[in-house]
Interface confidence: low
């Protein structure tokens, strides 16, 4: 539909509250360093302008595109050049180049202070004093730290954040009520951000076709009773929603996501039997619920795939006539039969099938050539199955912390050039796959584990892209989206790496480590472990374990000492000397 005023159209569709929240998210995701007050001012100006357009769609500038309106507003920020450097050059460009320029300057790892949680009473006072500002600040802080966070989903998080404070600030024990809820929101928020980052990377780095293939596979697993045409319609609409959000078109994205949820709920009967509860919820909860809904039961009478995709004499004719539709059908049919496979595995199988048809349909006897194509799938299926089995056994043997340490060592040896904070963050997240997925029965392990690993390895890829230091990482990240995990798994110790010079300062610790939370203390120890491996990449597991055990004992001893700082200074020197000797540094 063509609207005289796009800004009026979106304001009316979304309502003032959601409009303002989404504009704030959009601005904070673009200008990540701007103070909160500056963003609120810009949002209020845009909102007032939108209201004039609602009153009269023919008013001056109301016919301008949202990118033009928002870009013009962002470019009024006085300190743009001082704060953002070359991003200010975006403002010299015209749309659509200006928006593309802003998108390219989004920073996945902005130099912002860690969010420190104030005391519960302080938070409750701030919440009661000015609820609106308190919630806006939440949106602003999350959006600027996560510039690709899925905006309509962030509205859902904000709604839960508000509900937590509304309930808990009246409770007898405010902290006991509030803190677990905030921890849950924080952890879910990080996971949600990382999942969306993969969707945006998929669209931006590998194109719409790659995203659509992912969506066909995932939706076919989730809605195995839906017809192919129905799944294809959902994929087309979902692709539009995510393309918009990843492109900074947050108002359109939120509006289209609401339309998609409405369509799904109106057509439940031809999509899935699992949607009933979701569809009874209010809009934000409904959309979230649909996105997380469990897989429907597979139809009982599905025929063998071989008939249509191997045995039929028309395979090449069908393939040649409409390649992507035929491959889409293959992926749909395979995925709906295999909720036990990861999406990336299904995409590897589809790619193998496509490659086989490309080769065989040009051969003298195509049918003879592709007759055994399903046999080629066996090793592709077994590889992740075996890897997950081995790693779940290791996880069950070691527990999460030591399993993370094993992965830290493994990945530091593979790509030692990567920065230590990135290696720690990524390896810790890789290690969480154990507690997240190994508890599941076999039929659910692979989709849980391998699709989660895809999300985590994408974090490595986007962080590495900002400051590329390793050709091996670049290669695994850019060659094939679906083969990233096998590519990293296949990396051996980097024999070309020149060990880091030993620096005693890296291994100097102070009494402040004693007041850290258990998680922060683990991160300190894991940082030291990465540095150790960078100094001595050929160190054995046993050597590293011995040094880490000594280190843990040293921290425990000094944290119990009366004069902690002296203990850390004196015992620390001894520990460094002993570690150097043990590792032959």
């Amino acid at each position: 539909d063509a609207h005289k005023s796009e800004v009026a159209h979106r304001f009316k569709d979304l309502g003032e509250e959601n409009f303002k929240a989404l504009v704030l998210i959009a601005f904070a995701q673009y200008l990540q360093q701007c103070p909160f007050e500056d963003h609120v001012k810009l949002v209020n100006e845009v909102t007032e302008f939108a209201k004039t357009c609602v009153a009269d769609e023919s008013a001056e500038n109301c016919d301008k595109s949202l990118h033009t309106l928002f870009g013009d507003k962002l470019c009024t920020v006085a300190t743009l050049r001082e704060t953002y450097g070359e991003m200010a050059d975006c403002c010299a460009k015209q749309e659509p180049e200006r928006n593309e320029c802003f998108l390219q300057h989004k920073d996945d790892n902005p130099n912002l202070p860690r969010l420190v949680r104030p005391e519960v009473d302080v938070m409750c006072t701030a919440f009661h004093d000015n609820e609106e500002t308190f919630l806006k600040k939440y949106l602003y802080e999350i959006a600027r730290r996560h510039p690709y966070f899925y905006a309509p989903e962030l509205l859902f998080f904000a709604k839960r954040y508000k509900a937590a404070f509304t309930e808990c600030c009246q409770a007898a024990d405010k902290a006991a009520c509030l803190l677990p809820k905030l921890d849950e929101l924080r952890d879910e928020g990080k996971a949600s951000s990382a999942k969306q980052r993969l969707k945006c990377a998929s669209l931006q780095k590998f194109g719409e076709r790659a995203f659509k293939a992912w969506a066909v596979a995932r939706l076919s697993q989730r809605f195995p009773k839906a017809e192919f045409a129905e799944v294809s319609k959902l994929v087309t609409d979902l692709t539009k929603v995510h393309t918009e959000c990843c492109h900074g078109d947050l108002l359109e994205c939120a509006d289209d996501r609401a339309d998609l949820a409405k369509y799904i709920c109106e057509n439940q009967d031809s999509i899935s039997s699992k949607l009933k509860e979701c569809c009874e919820k209010p809009l934000l909860e409904k959309s979230h619920c649909i996105a997380e809904v469990e897989n429907d039961e597979m139809p009982a009478d599905l025929p063998s795939l071989a008939a249509d995709f191997v045995e039929s004499k028309d395979v090449c004719k069908n393939y040649a006539e409409a390649k992507d539709v035929f491959l889409g059908m293959f992926l749909y049919e395979y995925a709906r039969r295999h909720p036990d496979y990861s999406v990336v595995l299904l995409l590897r199988l589809a790619k193998t099938y496509e490659t086989t048809l490309e080769k065989c349909c040009a051969a003298a006897d195509p049918h003879e050539c592709y007759a055994k194509v399903f046999d080629e799938f066996k090793p592709l299926v077994e590889e992740p199955q075996n890897l997950i089995k081995q790693n779940c056994e290791l996880f069950e043997q070691l527990g999460e912390y030591k399993f993370q340490n094993a992965l830290l060592v493994r990945y530091t040896k593979k790509v030692p050039q990567v920065s230590t904070p990135t290696l720690v963050e990524v390896s810790r997240n890789l290690g969480k796959v154990g507690s997240k997925c190994c508890k599941h029965p076999e039929a659910k392990r692979m989709p849980c584990a391998e699709d989660y690993l895809s999300v985590v390895l994408n974090q490595l890829c986007v962080l590495h892209e900002k400051t590329p230091v390793s050709d091996r990482v670049t290669k695994c990240c850019t060659e094939s989206l679906v083969n990233r995990r096998p590519c990293f798994s296949a990396l051996e110790v980097d024999e070309t790496y020149v060990p880091k010079e030993f620096n005693a300062e890296t291994f100097t610790f102070h009494a402040d480590i004693c007041t850290l939370s258990e998680k922060e203390r683990q991160i300190k120890k894991q940082t030291a472990l990465v540095e150790l491996v960078k100094h001595k990449p050929k160190a054995t597991k046993e050597q590293l374990k011995a040094v880490m055990d000594d280190f843990a004992a040293f921290v425990e001893k000094c944290c119990k000492a009366d004069d902690k700082e002296t203990c850390f200074a004196e015992e620390g020197k001894k520990l460094v000397a002993a570690s150097q000797a043990a590792l032959g540094l």
């Epitope: 192919f228 045409a229 129905e230 294809s232 319609k233 087309t236 004719k317 069908n318 006539e321 409409a322």
Partner: nanobody, 115 residues
Framework: QVQLVESGGGLVQPGGSLRLSCAAS????????MSWVRQAPGKGPEWVSA????????RYAETVKGRFTISRDNLKKTLYLQMNSLKPEDTAVYYC????????GSQGTQVTVSS
């Protein structure tokens, strides 16, 4: 709700013409290749003709080449099959499908060629 509704069938004498239409709804018609398939009494489905999503690439079964023409109007979300020089062996139920699938169960339209 995804729907494909065929129309335009009927009784025609050998050598005569018919134009079949297939109105699509509930999915992004312009994104998909489409086909016409027919099923004669007591026989399995037989692929007749296909057209790509943009309408540029068309394909025909040997049995209808030179007599049938497939076309589409993406704005109207409609697929067509112009059938000329009809023969008694063209008698069948004709139905349209997405891509080259014969799995989607639409009602079809009956074409009978008889003197």
């Amino acid at each position: 709700q995804v729907q494909l509704v065929e129309s335009g069938g009927g009784l025609v004498q050998p050598g005569g013409s018919l134009r079949l239409s297939c109105a699509a709804s509930g999915f992004t018609f312009g994104s998909f290749g489409m086909s016409w398939v027919r099923q004669a009494p007591g026989k399995g489905p037989e692929w007749v003709s296909a057209i790509d999503s943009g309408g540029a690439d068309t394909r025909y079964a040997e049995t209808v080449k030179g007599r049938f023409t497939i076309s589409r109007d993406n704005l109207k979300k409609t697929l067509y099959l112009q059938m000329n020089s009809l023969k008694p062996e063209d008698t069948a139920v004709y139905y349209c499908t997405i891509g080259r699938s014969t799995s989607r169960g639409s009602q079809g339209t009956q074409v009978t060629v008889s003197s």
